[in-house]
Interface confidence: low
């Protein structure tokens, strides 16, 4: 009886009709940059204020007839999806609409820029509560549009945009490619990526998450009580704008970085059939479908992390790729990946006062990706400790020697074109968890962080026989901060984090005999923050009987490490 | 925005001295870049967003826009300033011939110029 899309974004064990109160999102204002809208539609009447902003190009074609219902169609539907009485996500959110798309759904980059500037000026003149800006539009990659989005985001505005309906890499489009914007792809009732005619939803590393975007029932501009089904990444973005409004209404102080991390954290994981995406995009595309959090509060104690992939380095010998975290995030680890396996590892380095993750291509390689693990860790003080290649045959090792610093990630980088296999694999001595080890010809980089209550442990999973993929996951209550492979030999394609699982990929089994050089160990560093837990508990009071602290005390950490001896 | 097409004579006279001086010459070695949409059918040649360096004030943006108009007028080109940006990015939106791009890229404070392009409802 309730539309599938509203059911889908409701957390398990909750009923959508009871979960979405009539004032959900009421502290938030959502700006919609789209077509004109039918503001007296029953779904949105009294909820949407039509601003006097209009900047649209002339319609194409001499025989074009301006028909009000057609002109208003796209915007009216989206306003309904965000805040409609019946079919809306955030039924209490108030909206303001700006007309930047004409009756054919076409606008300009310049018109959109002027619209964004209008929002910024409105915000300065009359500061209100949290602002969400919905951009259900896309054009080709635009440096200036991305820059404007970045500035608005840095002014505290949450921007949500459509990934695009071109069945293509979202990084080729704007504003979808702007890192500060929350970019949303579309999935259907079967959690499949949405196909739209011969095209479909965009994908790739510039997409933050997916949301319902096919057969979405919402307000139709044909009459004031009409409803219609529409599909597209605009509809998906409207769902996320609504979810963002709900979250911000519950926690108005959330920063953009915190909101993005929560959107990712509360999403349904690994439900999308990746076979729909081109093979080279599967690893880059997040397998996440947006959902509302199970309760409005209580997420604050968790250590939130996300994985950020760089652009592809390109194939030149000295090519590098750089992955960056958002300004409010900490880079806790850095890894790399190459489909050909030809890479020279990765390193964390300072750039403009912030750590970035840089991956290095190798001669004959088709290029590499850098993969950053970006986390929310307030009051963190992180540094990188480096050990040059070791002289001895034991391999290189580096540890966190400063008092109170814990190891959050390990990276290794080598200058030689091909690392020889390294037998036997280096075993970490018991009782020394705070150290990274690697190949003797590689320099090793340890990410060492001090933050109140931060504790980490190392978890390994080794496979003696060659296997294309080795994984190790952090258990409930712990967050994956670091993911790397032991040893860093040439048949390892790389390592990367998927949600809370560390994935190490190796060359096709058939190319690496079954000798010990096929052996691979995936190394995960799992962390949690007792400080965040305590702060959250203080905020909520001790209403829950036994507090989180007691739970943590009962689970005193033991530094268990399972060492796999390969024969 | 009022039509400024009739103001060239006055602008040329007013800006001649400023233009000939080196007070606001672009810094040595920093060249502004030009960008346009990779998807040809979506390009909108003839309209350009001139983005100025980050700390540029509104008055400098307006002065740079007038300077472009004056220099264009001296070369016999009509231009129209459609919008002056401030608040998010400093710069201006100008309707002009693509022939003037080389000239515009050499203006003081210019960071980059982007040709306007289409966006579409998704």
């Amino acid at each position: 009886s309730i539309p599938w899309n509203l059911e889908r974004i409701t957390p398990p064990r909750y009923r959508a009709d009871e979960y979405q109160p009539p004032d959900g999102g009421s502290l938030v204002e959502v700006y919609l940059l789209d077509t004109s809208i039918q503001s007296d539609h029953r779904e949105i009447e009294g909820r949407v204020m039509v601003t006097d902003f209009e900047n649209v190009p002339e319609e194409d074609g001499t025989r074009f007839h301006r028909q009000a219902s057609k002109c208003d169609s796209h915007g009216t539907h989206l306003a309904g999806v965000v805040s409609g009485r019946d079919a809306g996500v955030a039924k209490g959110a108030s909206m303001r609409s700006l007309r930047v798309l004409n009756c054919q759904g076409k606008g300009t980059v310049s018109g959109t820029l002027i619209g964004l500037e209008f929002i910024r000026k409105s915000q300065l003149v009359q500061p209100v509560g949290p602002l969400v800006v919905l951009l259900p539009l896309a054009g080709g990659y635009s440096r200036v549009l991305n820059a404007a989005c970045q500035r608005l985001a840095r002014a505290g505005v949450v921007l949500v945009t459509a990934a695009g309906n071109f069945r293509d890499d979202a990084c080729l489009y704007s504003p979808a490619s702007a890192p500060e914007v929350i970019t949303v792809g579309a999935t259907n009732a079967q959690d499949q990526p949405v196909t739209l005619g011969t095209l479909g939803t965009n994908f790739g590393r510039c997409v933050d998450l997916f949301a319902p975007g096919e057969d979405i029932i919402g307000a139709s501009s044909d009459c004031s009580t009409c409803f219609v089904s529409q599909s597209g990444t605009s509809q998906a973005a409207a769902h996320v704008a609504g979810i963002a409004a709900m979250m911000l209404s519950a926690e108005p102080e959330l920063t953009l970085a915190e909101l993005r991390q929560r959107l990712i954290h509360f999403s349904a994981k690994d439900v999308i059939n990746e076979a729909w995406f081109p093979e080279d995009q599967r690893v880059l595309t997040p397998n996440l479908v947006a959902a509302l959090p199970p309760s409005t509060h209580g997420a604050g104690w968790q250590l939130f992390c996300r994985t950020v992939w760089s652009a592809h380095s390109g194939p030149t010998r000295m090519a590098t790729a750089v992955a960056r975290c958002a300004p409010d995030e900490e880079l806790l680890s850095c890894s790399s990946f190459s489909r050909s396996g030809k890479r020279r590892g990765e390193r964390m380095e300072a750039q403009g006062g912030k750590l970035v993750c840089r991956a290095h291509n190798a001669f004959g390689g088709e290029g590499v990706y850098a993969i950053a693990r970006c986390c929310l860790l307030p009051q963190a003080n992180c540094s990188v400790h480096t050990a040059p290649p070791a002289e001895a045959s034991m391999g290189t090792r580096v540890h966190c020697h400063q008092q109170g610093h814990v190891l959050t990630g390990c990276s290794s980088h080598w200058e030689v074109e091909d690392l020889g296999t390294h037998k036997p694999p280096v075993l970490r001595p018991r009782g020394q968890p705070n150290q990274c080890v690697g190949h003797r010809e590689a320099s090793i980089h340890a990410s060492c962080c001090h933050a109140p209550g931060l504790e980490c442990k190392v978890k390994e999973h080794g496979i003696p026989a060659p296997q294309e993929q080795v994984t190790v996951a952090c258990e409930e209550g712990w967050t994956l901060t670091g993911c790397s492979a032991l040893p860093g030999t040439s048949h390892v394609l790389g390592a990367y984090a998927v949600d809370n699982t560390c994935v190490v990929r190796s060359r096709d089994v058939s190319t690496t005999g079954s000798t010990s050089e096929g052996a691979v160990t995936a190394v995960a560093i799992c962390c949690r923050s007792r400080h965040l837990a305590q702060a959250s508990q203080e905020l909520q009071g001790s209403t829950s009987g036994s507090g989180l602290n007691d739970i943590f005390e009962a689970q005193k950490i033991e530094w268990h490490e399972h060492h796999h001896h390969h024969h | 925005q009022e039509d400024e097409d009739g103001d060239y004579e006055e602008l040329v006279l007013a800006l001649r001295s400023e233009e000939d001086g080196l007070a606001e010459a672009p810094e040595h070695g920093t060249t502004a870049t030009f960008h346009r949409c990779a998807k040809d059918p979506w390009r909108l040649p003839g309209t350009y967003v001139v983005v100025l360096k980050e700390e540029t004030h509104l008055s400098q943006s307006e002065r740079t826009a007038r300077r472009l108009q004056a220099q264009a007028a001296r070369r016999g080109y009509l231009t129209k300033i459609l919008h002056v940006f401030h608040g998010l990015l400093p710069g201006f939106l100008v309707k002009m011939s693509g022939d003037l791009l080389e000239l515009a890229l050499k203006l003081p404070h210019v960071d980059y110029i982007e040709e306007d392009s289409s966006v579409f409802a998704q």
Epitope: I2, P21, P22, S26, K91 | -
Partner: antibody
């Protein structure tokens, strides 16, 4: 004038279904949600759910979710409530009531006269 | 679900008396966007359908005599009849519409 006229009394056996109608007149049917409320003998009022005639969307109280179906026929401005797998404790007066479809008007300003449904073997 | 608790469940009074019925909700009914309390009061006479008296906690429905008034905000609400008339003897229900709809159990007002 505005009125909601409900169908007549019904006597049903346990396990059967009942379908009650509510015909609206004197106003634009699509502009108001139609709610159904029941009242067992000597008891209070119990909200069952609603239908939005313009969209056909329904929301049901969880106590009835598996057994109730609300529908409408906009061509004759009539709403229907069907309750299946009847039990003796479903014996009650069933009311339809309208609510203006506007987010500040969450109250029922016009009610039907009620339909008595008796479930007895 | 939001629970609605009315008190008293019954009361006896005489014509001309001032009568107060209270209603408590298990969570706030104040809609933060509209600044309105989503609470209504209904009157029901035997064998009849309920009739709307008050909505938004304190707004009288048109045609309802001004001796009926509603007050309160958040979780505590009151229906007051300033001077009882013979036709006022009935059962009164409060109802929340903040999240779906729930009625109070009713207050039966009888002649003393």
């Amino acid at each position: 004038q505005v009125q909601l006229v409900q169908s007549g009394a019904e006597v049903k056996k346990p396990g059967a279904s009942v379908k009650v109608s509510c015909k609206a007149s004197g106003y634009t049917f699509n502009d108001y949600w139609m709610h159904w409320v029941r009242q067992a003998p000597g008891q209070g009022l119990e909200w069952m759910g609603y239908i939005n005639p313009s969209s056909g969307f329904t929301k049901y109280h969880q106590n009835f979710k598996d057994r109730v179906t609300m529908t409408r026929d906009t061509s004759i401005s009539t709403a229907y409530m069907e309750l299946s797998r009847l039990r003796s404790d479903d014996t009650a007066v069933y009311y339809c009531a309208r609510q203006y479809d506007y987010d500040e008007d969450w109250y029922f300003d016009v009610w039907g006269q009620g339909t008595t449904v008796t479930v007895s073997s | 679900d939001i629970q609605m608790t009315q008190s008293p469940s019954s009361l006896s009074a005489s014509v001309g008396d001032r009568v107060t019925i209270t209603c408590k909700s298990s969570q706030s009914l104040l809609n933060s966007r509209t600044r309105k309390n989503f609470l209504a009061w209904y009157q029901q006479k035997p064998g009849k359908a309920p009739k709307l008296l008050i909505y938004w906690a304190s707004t009288r429905e048109s045609g309802v005599p001004d001796r009926f008034s509603g007050s309160g905000s958040g979780t505590d609400f009151t229906l007051t009849i300033s001077s009882l008339q013979p036709e006022d003897f009935a059962t009164y229900y409060c109802k929340q519409s903040f999240n779906l709809f729930t009625f109070g159990q009713g207050t039966k007002l009888e002649i003393k």
